[in-house]
Amino acid sequence: KSSNEATNITPKHNMKAFLDELKAENIKKFLYNFTQIPHLAGTEQNFQLAKQIQSQWKEFGLDSVELAHYDVLLSYPNKTHPNYISIINEDGNEIFNTSLFEPPPPGYENVSDIVPPFSAFSPQGMPEGDLVYVNYARTEDFFKLERDMKINCSGKIVIARYGKVFRGNKVKNAQLAGAKGVILYSDPADYFAPGVKSYPDGWNLPGGGVQRGNILNLNGAGDPLTPGYPANEYAYRRGIAEAVGLPSIPVHPIGYYDAQKLLEKMGGSAPPDSSWRGSLKVPYNVGPGFTGNFSTQKVKMHIHSTNEVTRIYNVIGTLRGAVEPDRYVILGGHRDSWVFGGIDPQSGAAVVHEIVRSFGTLKKEGWRPRRTILFASWDAEEFGLLGSTEWAEENSRLLQERGVAYINADSSIEGNYTLRVDCTPLMYSLVHNLTKELKSPDEGFEGKSLYESWTKKSPSPEFSGMPRISKLGSGNDFEVFFQRLGIASGRARYTKNWETNKFSGYPLYHSVYETYELVEKFYDPMFKYHLTVAQVRGGMVFELANSIVLPFDCRDYAVVLRKYADKIYSISMKHPQEMKTYSVSFDSLFSAVKNFTEIASKFSERLQDFDKSNPIVLRMMNDQLMFLERAFIDPLGLPDRPFYRHVIYAPSSHNKYAGESFPGIYDALFDIESKVDPSKAWGEVKRQIYVAAFTVQAAAETLSEVA
């Protein structure tokens, strides 16, 4: 399928022209420009960068570029009253204090406004007490502590290692366990790859490096004070007591040097098994409290951060479509960073910048896309996806009627091993076809396609000869578009070898050491992986905006629906007696999936055969494809999570980063054996099966012949 059929273009203006215009050297230059000073959300520096990007996008040739501002709740440390944690002796004297700031990297000693490590939205407080080590603070870790080890976290300060799950879930779990404070730390087992030096000599985390991050449990709400609606000039704001998702106990992050000082004194229970041991030179005792000689010592937190309503700025650029200007393909990524943002987000923002430049170059030569392309530089992603969510809330009516697709563009790299793609099943074939046309940047795959190197290095667990494509979870700006609005979404980046590198994310994530030099020296000196990611993201946008028939294959949804139905059924079948007792049947769901499969197959046949020269029929078929994702939206949302409305996918209730399939049923079944009222619990399972079956059937019917 060619993409050069859009109006007013010469044959040279096709996908190849767009891709050929993308240059690694430009991405490198843009990354350098975006990373010389911090661009924390809500600061003057980030406002200035917004205006710079607005100006440059205009120069590149976009039709319009506007700033969209909102006044949202952000969180900052107190500049004169720093946050830290102490070990105190029986007299209350501080005998050890954790760091007040990270040791600055070489060349950045004199940079001002480096925000010290903090957990954004932590309440103020100075709790003191005994420590309990809770491993990763996952749901299963607290089950192990409370149910198996009979350790009570109530009134304790818990210390948890970063990794495996979103930090906000850790804090929520700690709160539910009754903890009065949370210390988060980066263990070398998760953030120090063997055989690699720490920064500035390599890409590993030094002992003084600390991961910043928000600890909200927003569940898609956006600004905590204006859930569901934009935080505009006339917004009604909730009181702080009614704000969505704020933690109720003080939280603070530390590095592994400081963690060693706390953990080396731990007494109490030994770790339950080896999975609770990290790589520090400590016993990983669970506690509570310190061992014999140190048993009178306590841990004290000193947290003085403040929550403040602050103005943020999105940059929204428009390249008007020539044929279907009322159909929007969106490419968006955030601009705000915790410090320099060498990887997160500026490796993504630099790629977006080059994609805009390439599209602009084509436009200046007389080309236009078939559909409108919107480009977004989001603000305050690090504070809870606030910029993207507020903009989507403000424009929800337009988006739900006109939104074709959203492609996310945060960090372009989290490693340099192979491609990683998470997307709606509708985009599987698009991604496969595109990557077959792109050259692999990988060593040993010269002259081979990206598809080939990706499939070799990251094979699909289900289909031989195909690459792994993962479910969308959350923790990034696609959330509101996909989970709330039901707009087909996807993301792509270069990643590490998950088999050999078992650390979580990349070691320097959200630390002061995430610099331009980190990328240029250690990850991608030639910027060839950045260029490949630009080709993938840009190529997807090009096809989505320019192909006559939308490049969505509804049959791929049918395949995964069957897989997800099988999976949730097998989970339920772990309780055969209860299923029999409460007459739990999945027949309706399997029937709906079967119907969806048959209808999707027939739709695909019609898609091959219809008269593409008939604009009405073309538009009709494209609308059925566009609105298929929308059909999976339940207007009532998931239980207790009204802004997660997608019935097939939602962020896991136990890890915001991970996607869960049939989340309503999954959550109803989770830990069901511990529910006090089994009849009520299994009743909810049945209700969720009903909702899922209805939704799949209803979605199938949107693909039926219209009359």
């Epitope: 040791p103 600055p104 990297p105 070489p106 000693e109 030094p206 003084g208 030179k281």
Partner: antibody, heavy 120, light 108 residues
Framework: QVQLVESGGGVVQPGRSLRLSCAAS????????MNWVRQAPGKGLEWVAI????????YYADSVKGRFTISRDISKNTLYLQMNSLRAEDTAVYYC?????????????WGQGTTVTVSS | SYELMQPPSVSVSPGQTARITCSGD??????AYWYQQKPGQAPVLVIY???ERPSGIPVRFSGSSSGTTVTLTITGVQAEDEADYYC??????????FGTGTKVTVLG
């Protein structure tokens, strides 16, 4: 290049005070913990004091606690050791040594030392 | 106060292996560091974090740790390795301590 240069040593009477300085150059002073280590004539190394890069912690050997004070001036890239109530047993070569802040890289750069003699 | 014990001296022929031990109760929870000091000179770091070698230090120097003992091994000793060697570690109160020191003599 990376360099530490101590100064301020000399001969002093017991009970008197002395201030040692250590001028740092060629590296990011604000990223390094700084130590004082001494060596009495013909004896082994004795750690004296440490100040963390962010000044969050200062620790002293029991033998000098209450008498010596470690400090630093980031603007001058200089480390200090204020030594009060000096004793004969404080006679030693005093070295300053850096270690990367909150890390496990050890004291990787040392000065050449300055000699303190406490004698009546 | 906390002590790190080393043998006062070790003698070794050129090309042979020298092993210097350092014992202390806190070593299972604390990293050890090794320094070489030649007469009239400042100490030089030769091993950090129990077993890591700084750049510029010959590969014949290695470190290991087991329980309350750490060991510095010099494989294929050379004449220029004759020096005093000190281990160093920390205790749980945040203070540092040096070992008693070991004089390595290269025979012949």
């Amino acid at each position: 290049q990376v360099q530490l240069v101590e100064s301020g040593g000399g001969v002093v009477q017991p009970g008197r005070s002395l201030r040692l300085s250590c001028a740092a150059s060629g590296f990011t002073f604000s990223s390094y913990n700084m130590n004082w280590v001494r060596q009495a004539p013909g004896k082994g190394l004795e750690w004296v004091a440490i100040i963390y890069y962010d000044e969050s912690n200062k620790y002293y050997a029991d033998s000098v606690k209450g008498r010596f004070t470690i400090s630093r001036d980031i603007s001058k890239n200089t480390l200090y050791l204020q030594m009060n109530s000096l004793r004969a047993e404080d006679t030693a070569v005093y070295y300053c040594a850096r270690e990367r802040g909150r890390d496990y890289y050890g004291m990787d750069v040392w000065g050449q030392g300055t000699t303190v003699t406490v004698s009546s | 106060s906390y002590e790190l014990m080393q043998p006062p001296s070790v003698s070794v022929s050129p090309g042979q292996t020298a092993r210097i031990t350092c014992s202390g109760d806190a070593l299972p929870k604390q990293y050890a560091y090794w320094y070489q000091q030649k007469p009239g000179q400042a100490p030089v770091l030769v091993i950090y974090k129990d077993s890591e070698r700084p750049s510029g230090i010959p590969v014949r120097f290695s470190g290991s740790s087991s329980g309350t003992t750490v060991t510095l091994t010099i494989t294929g000793v050379q004449a220029e390795d004759e020096a005093d060697y000190y281990c160093q570690s920390a205790d749980s109160s945040g203070t540092y301590v040096f070992g008693t020191g070991t004089k390595v003599t290269v025979l012949g």
